[in-house]
């Protein structure tokens, strides 16, 4: 069956600063920011596009060791997201996958709101545990404001924005900014 | 079904070498870490450790580390605790289980559980 | 490493009975707790996740509460089959994963 949950919740960065950070480079932030709650993230294949694929492994003390998503769209102009896990866990026994949406709505004070959808595809007769939804909303939440407090301390990061390549940052082209660059030469 | 199941009985003598075996069904293996459990007789449960199937990670309990180690077949699903030399004070029944939990949160537990392989060190 | 500690150590208890048996851990851990059963010559079966989640095909007799540092396993209406070794175990803080010490039940 599907099981669909959704779920919003505010921050006070604008919707493009936060597309920019939170989704754009979170395969470098969340490890930095809330490494209680992601170790790594590496790209297994693409360019960040849809169809990648990202391992993003667990610290120790969490029950697995990593998942594995897939891109399935990135909407730069409407800030959207779309993403599945599709590997590690319970994925494959009792959950084929996890859909997930993302949209970043600005506010107008300023902020944003994210609208998140999360759909949960089980195997046969299996149910989601209430606490697999609540874990799910929570980790959302951590990382989240983890981002955001990064955000508010570092105020020039991902503002004006450049592409550039770097080696540091394992060859792949990312999003960032000047006064990132310093932190990633660093990390 | 999701099952685990453990080799036999072995009864040993002191300074002896054992090798024991966990193999798991009814799930994906390489996606939940297996860990290992000992009862010494009439006393509870003691946490050993943990490998994980997918790249054969290990997590040793400090009371256990440098007295077992454990191993993965991932191609045949089984887990191994081994012992290069045992000693009297080995003699207790030994668990394999599958750590299971939720996912993005510390919720962990263990399910199934092995039926258990008695290890008997004796001169 | 955080310890769990169980109380009773045993109890004895007829058929039908209420009972109740604490587990308190020597720090918070939420509720990461989980509760197993064992019976004599048998392996451990997970009863209760995460405090009071029931783990499919467990009875409705048995029910977990608690958070923080207490935690209680209570069984509302005692059967037969229910006679056994209780223990509770943490995984807020790993490793290692810490047991309780168990807790006998036995007919009076």
């Known amino acids: 069956g599907v099981f669909n949950y959704e779920t919003e919740t505010t921050s006070v960065i604008p919707a493009a600063r936060l597309f920019k950070a939170f989704i754009l480079d979170g395969d470098n932030l969340f490890p930095k920011v809330a490494p209680q709650a992601i170790s790594s993230v590496e790209n297994i294949e693409g360019n960040g596009g849809p169809g990648t694929i990202k391992k993003i492994s667990f610290p120790e003390g969490l029950p697995f060791k990593y998942v594995k998503d897939r891109v399935d769209e990135v909407d730069h102009t409407n800030f959207k997201y779309n993403y599945a896990v599709i590997e590690g866990g319970p994925i494959g026994d009792t959950l084929e996958k996890i859909s997930n949406e993302i949209k970043i709505v600005a506010t107008p004070d300023g902020g944003s709101i994210l609208k998140i959808s999360n759909k949960y595809h089980t195997k046969g007769d299996h149910e989601v545990k209430a606490e697999q939804v609540k874990a799910s909303k929570e980790m959302g939440e951590t990382l989240l404001r983890a981002v955001e407090s990064y955000l508010l301390a570092h105020s020039d990061a991902y503002n004006e924005q450049k592409l550039i390549s770097e080696e540091d940052l394992g060859g792949e082209q990312k999003l960032i900014s000047e006064e990132d660059l310093h932190h990633h030469h660093h990390h | 079904e999701v099952q685990l199941v453990q080799s036999g009985a072995e009864v040993k003598k002191p300074g002896e070498s054992l090798k024991i075996s966990c193999s798991g069904s009814?799930?994906?293996?390489?996606?939940?870490?297996i860990a290992w459990v000992r009862q010494m007789p009439g006393k509870g449960l003691e946490w050993m450790g943990l490998i994980h199937p997918d790249d054969s990670d290990i997590r040793y309990s400090p009371s256990f580390q440098g007295q077992v180690t454990f191993s993965v077949d991932k191609s045949i699903n089984t887990a191994y605790l081994q012992w290069s030399s045992l000693k009297a004070s080995d003699t207790a029944m030994y668990y394999c289980?599958?750590?299971?939990?939720?996912?993005?949160?510390?919720?962990?537990?263990?399910?199934?559980w092995g039926q258990g392989t008695l290890v008997t060190v004796s001169s | 490493d955080i310890q769990m500690t169980q109380s009773p150590s045993s109890l004895s208890a007829s058929v039908g009975d209420r009972v109740t048996i604490t587990c308190r851990a020597s720090?918070?851990?939420?509720?990461?707790l989980n509760w197993y059963q064992q019976k004599p010559g048998k392996a451990p079966k997970l009863l209760i996740y995460a405090a009071s989640s029931l783990q499919s095909g467990v009875p409705s007799r048995f029910s977990g509460s608690g958070s923080g540092t207490d935690f209680t396993l209570t069984i509302s209406s005692l059967q037969p089959e229910d006679f056994a070794t209780y223990y509770c175990?943490?995984?807020?803080?790993?490793?290692?994963?810490?047991f309780g010490q168990g807790t006998r039940l036995e007919i009076k």
């Open positions: 175990q943490q995984s807020y803080s790993t490793p290692p994963i810490t």
């Open positions: 720090q918070s851990i939420s509720s990461y």
């Open positions: 289980t599958r750590q299971d939990g939720i996912l993005w949160s510390h919720n962990a537990w263990f399910d199934p």
């Open positions: 009814g799930y994906r293996f390489t996606n939940y870490w």
